[in-house]
């Protein structure tokens, strides 16, 4: 549950990701936003980054949390099939911003059931540690739908 | 582990300029966004400027918007801080502060530069 | 902005005993799409740097002590220490992360 121990690498697409829309009429506004004109702006700005910034901190909570473990337990988990090895090694793969735009390339829960499943077999499988708990957080008391809904709205996929 | 030292405070004359500093190590400095938050005894703790890892996105708070601007050198590992038409208001300790994974959230302070203005 | 206050102003509690602050924001703070409450708190030693103790009102950052521990929801929130320690004597502030970055206005603990 460390901060200071992230995976940089995997943190940097933050900032960046949560520039304004490149939309030809907001042209000015975003103009104005990266040169912080408006204290609002940064609200916006904050807005944006926390559902990517919750999503980051899950894979670095996991990630720290397996580079603590023991090597030959991990192996053992994966060969028991209590580790879903190939969710896992896809997630600890790739960056956060790659990971929200496989959440968001469906447009809802209907429209992606296998991910939203693999989502949720994650957390089910997950149940001894934080990962788990975050994961249903979002899965189980708020709904996956909702919360992917949100991330369409904001437009992450659409940021350059 | 990480370290953050402010430098250039001093004591300047309202209407003047200075320009603080924070050097940072023990940390990919160009991966994390860095803020400015100062610390005046009347008024606690005040946050002052933002600026994203990748310099695209700067902000500020309304006490100092166009007066101050925040930059960074990454190649440098190097925070600045840029105060024009400093009045007595902006006396305070200035600090340099790391950005968590998580946006506005600190996880590393420096030590802070006192700044006076005063004639 | 949201307005944070805390109380009490200064507290003074005896070592081994619990010491508890409070805080409160002028608006919620806590962010449905996760339930989570944007709520984090410092310490400030003398000559020392500012330290982040909890963050999401109730996650100890790493390497600080178990007896630290936060709690709250919404506006209303709570800085305990279970059992005071000599090295605790600082002043204590919360801040809110959900929107523009304000802090309460501090809370000096010493020791009776």
């Known amino acids: 549950r460390s901060l200071q121990d992230t995976e940089e690498k995997s943190r940097s697409f933050s900032a960046s990701q949560a520039d304004p829309l490149s939309d030809p009429d907001q042209m000015n506004e975003d103009k104005r936003h990266s040169q912080g004109t408006f204290t609002s702006d940064y609200s916006k700005y904050l807005d944006s980054r926390r559902a990517q910034d919750f999503v980051q901190w899950l894979m670095n909570t996991k990630r720290n949390r397996n580079n603590i473990a023991k090597r030959h337990d991990e192996f053992e988990r994966h060969a028991e099939g209590t580790f879903t090895s190939d969710v896992s090694s896809y997630l600890e793969g790739q960056a956060a911003k790659e990971f929200i735009a496989w959440l968001v390339k469906g447009r809802g829960r209907r429209d992606f059931p296998e991910e939203v499943a693999i989502v949720e077999e994650l957390g089910r499988r997950h149940a001894d540690g934080s990962f788990s708990d975050e994961m249903n957080t979002i899965l189980d008391n708020l709904a996956a739908r909702d919360f992917i809904n949100w991330l369409i709205q904001t437009k992450i996929t659409d940021r350059k | 582990q990480v370290q953050l030292v402010e430098s250039g405070g001093g004591v300047v004359q309202p209407g003047r300029s200075l320009r603080l500093s924070c050097a940072a190590s023990?940390?990919?400095?160009?991966?994390?966004?860095m803020h400015w938050v100062r610390q005046a005894p009347v008024k606690g703790l005040e946050w002052v400027a933002f600026?994203?890892?990748?310099?695209?996105?700067?902000f500020y708070a309304d006490s100092v918007k166009g007066r101050f601007t925040i930059s960074r050198d990454n190649s440098k590992n190097t925070l600045f801080l840029e105060m024009n038409s400093l009045t007595a208001e902006d006396t305070a300790v200035y600090y340099c502060a790391k950005e968590s994974i998580l946006a506005a959230l600190f996880d590393y302070w420096g030590q802070g530069t006192l700044v006076t203005v005063s004639s | 902005d949201i307005v944070m206050t805390q109380s009490p102003d200064s507290l003074a509690v005896s070592l081994g005993e619990r010491a508890t602050i409070n805080c409160k924001s002028s608006q919620s703070v806590l962010y449905s799409s996760n339930n989570k409450n944007y709520l984090a708190w410092y310490q400030q030693k003398p000559r020392q740097p500012l330290k982040l103790l909890i963050y999401?009102?109730?996650i100890r950052e790493s390497g600080v002590p178990d007896r630290f521990s936060g709690s709250g929801s919404g506006t209303d929130f709570t800085l305990t220490i279970s059992s005071l320690q000599a090295e605790d004597v600082a002043v204590y502030y919360c801040?809110?992360?959900?929107?523009?970055?304000?802090f309460g206005q501090g809370t000096k603990l010493e020791i009776k």
């Open positions: 999401w009102a109730s």
């Open positions: 801040q809110q992360f959900y929107s523009v970055p304000t």
């Open positions: 600026i994203s890892n990748d310099k695209s996105n700067t």
């Open positions: 023990g940390f990919t400095f160009n991966t994390y966004g």
